[in-house]
Amino acid sequence: QGHLVHMTVVSGSNVTLNISESLPENYKQLTWFYTFDQKIVEWDSRKSKYFESKFKGRVRLDPQSGALYISKVQKEDNSTYIMRVLKKTGNEQEWKIKLQVLDPVPKPVIKIEKIEDMDDNCYLKLSCVIPGESVNYTWYGDKRPFPKELQNSVLETTLMPHNYSRCYTCQVSNSVSSKNGTVCLSPPCTLARS
């Protein structure tokens, strides 16, 4: 009974929830549930019944594979989906799919907190701003990644002349998308005019 699959998809996409194994042969009934107790659709003796739910009109069941097709998923569709199959023997088998729907990350804005010329070195503090999202950050100087320990929303570093970069890029990503923001400086250590 412990079949649990995790799925992460981008909001607005069409999703097919299905199991990796074959359905039991000649099963009697197949039901998809949303959050354990809300029926979405039930297949019974060659007929599907779609229940009144927020999914009505945007789901379709393929009884041969058991796949549930959902169009235009939204963040509110985050849930555990359960497919329950009643076998001819009277036994039930259950599969669970934990669906996580993520919005594509927005384009980040790089905010220059501080730039300071310090004895030929350049002290730099840049922050990568995006509205309240749980994302990963990667900073690049002229397309070369900074060390892992500097990878968070704020890049704070002192650069020596041989390490200067003209442009600094913040890449924000989640498991479904990534976007870049870039700011360019005039060597050695001043903001470039756009």
Epitope: G12, S48, K49, Y50, K56, G57, R58, R60, D62, Y69
Partner: antibody, heavy 120, light 109 residues
Framework: QVQLVQSGAEAREPGASVRVSCKAS????????IHWVRQAPGQGLEWMGW????????NFAQKFQGRVTMTRDTSLITAYMDLSRLKSDDAAVFYC?????????????WGQGTLVTVSS | EIVLTQSPATLSLSPGERATLSCRAS??????LAWYQQKPGQAPRLLIY???NRATGIPARFSGSGSGTDFTLTISRLEPEDFAVYYC???????????FGQGTRLEIK
């Protein structure tokens, strides 16, 4: 047995509105979407939209947005389609149809059609 | 918006022959495609849905196949009552909307 019975033929002038009704019997009215499809003389099928009789929620083809209204009266087990600002090329047979299984994907039972003519 | 293109526009065959009608989608519709038959002065009738499932009461001589973008309706042995116009239909996901192909007229040769 499942039946959809539509109202009779209508004649209208350009700019007017028309209402077509579709009375259902033989099944649970609120379990299945009612779709409206039109067919101009000698032409193919054109989907106009659907109504979920349970909730009253509607969904229209882009082309008819703002000009079509779909309603239902669950006590009369009847769906209605109103089309406003009629033009001469709106002349067509209008069909109501029930979807096959309550999913909104395919249409298995159809009304007999209502002919609407539009001319001045 | 997904466009369905049916071919041929007209098919001339004799009773007893095999008819093969084609429907091509401009992008993948998975298996979510249906076929309808319409005779003059009548409402359409659902024949096949989900590409290959026969609707209730449809004779076994009608069969559907295909997935993705290419679909076929086959009538294994034409009966006189099969001569009609055939439409394929799919449903776009967003906004949810149904579209039909332009139709194939099956006529007696």
């Amino acid at each position: 047995q499942v039946q959809l019975v539509q109202s009779g033929a209508e004649a209208r002038e350009p700019g007017a509105s028309v209402r077509v009704s579709c009375k259902a019997s033989g099944y649970t009215f609120t379990d299945y979407f009612i779709h409206w499809v039109r067919q101009a003389p000698g032409q193919g099928l054109e989907w106009m939209g659907w109504i979920n009789p349970n909730s009253g929620a509607t969904n229209f083809a882009q082309k008819f947005q703002g000009r079509v209204t779909m309603t239902r009266d669950t006590s009369l087990i009847t769906a209605y389609m109103d089309l406003s600002r009629l033009k001469s090329d709106d002349a067509a047979v209008f069909y109501c149809a029930r979807d096959v299984d309550g999913s909104g994907w395919y249409l298995d039972f159809w009304g007999q059609g209502t002919l609407v003519t539009v001319s001045s | 918006e997904i466009v369905l293109t049916q071919s041929p526009a007209t098919l001339s065959l004799s009773p007893g022959e095999r008819a093969t009608l084609s429907c091509r989608a401009s992008q993948s519709v998975s298996i979510y495609l249906a076929w309808y038959q319409q005779k003059p002065g009548q409402a359409p009738r659902l024949l096949i849905y989900d590409a290959s499932n026969r609707a209730t009461g449809i004779p076994a001589r009608f069969s559907g196949s295909g997935s993705g973008t290419d679909f076929t309706l086959t009538i294994s042995r034409l009966e006189p009552e099969d001569f009609a116009v055939y439409y394929c239909q799919q449903r776009s996901d967003w906004p949810p909307s149904i579209t039909f192909g332009q139709g194939t007229r099956l006529e007696i040769k």
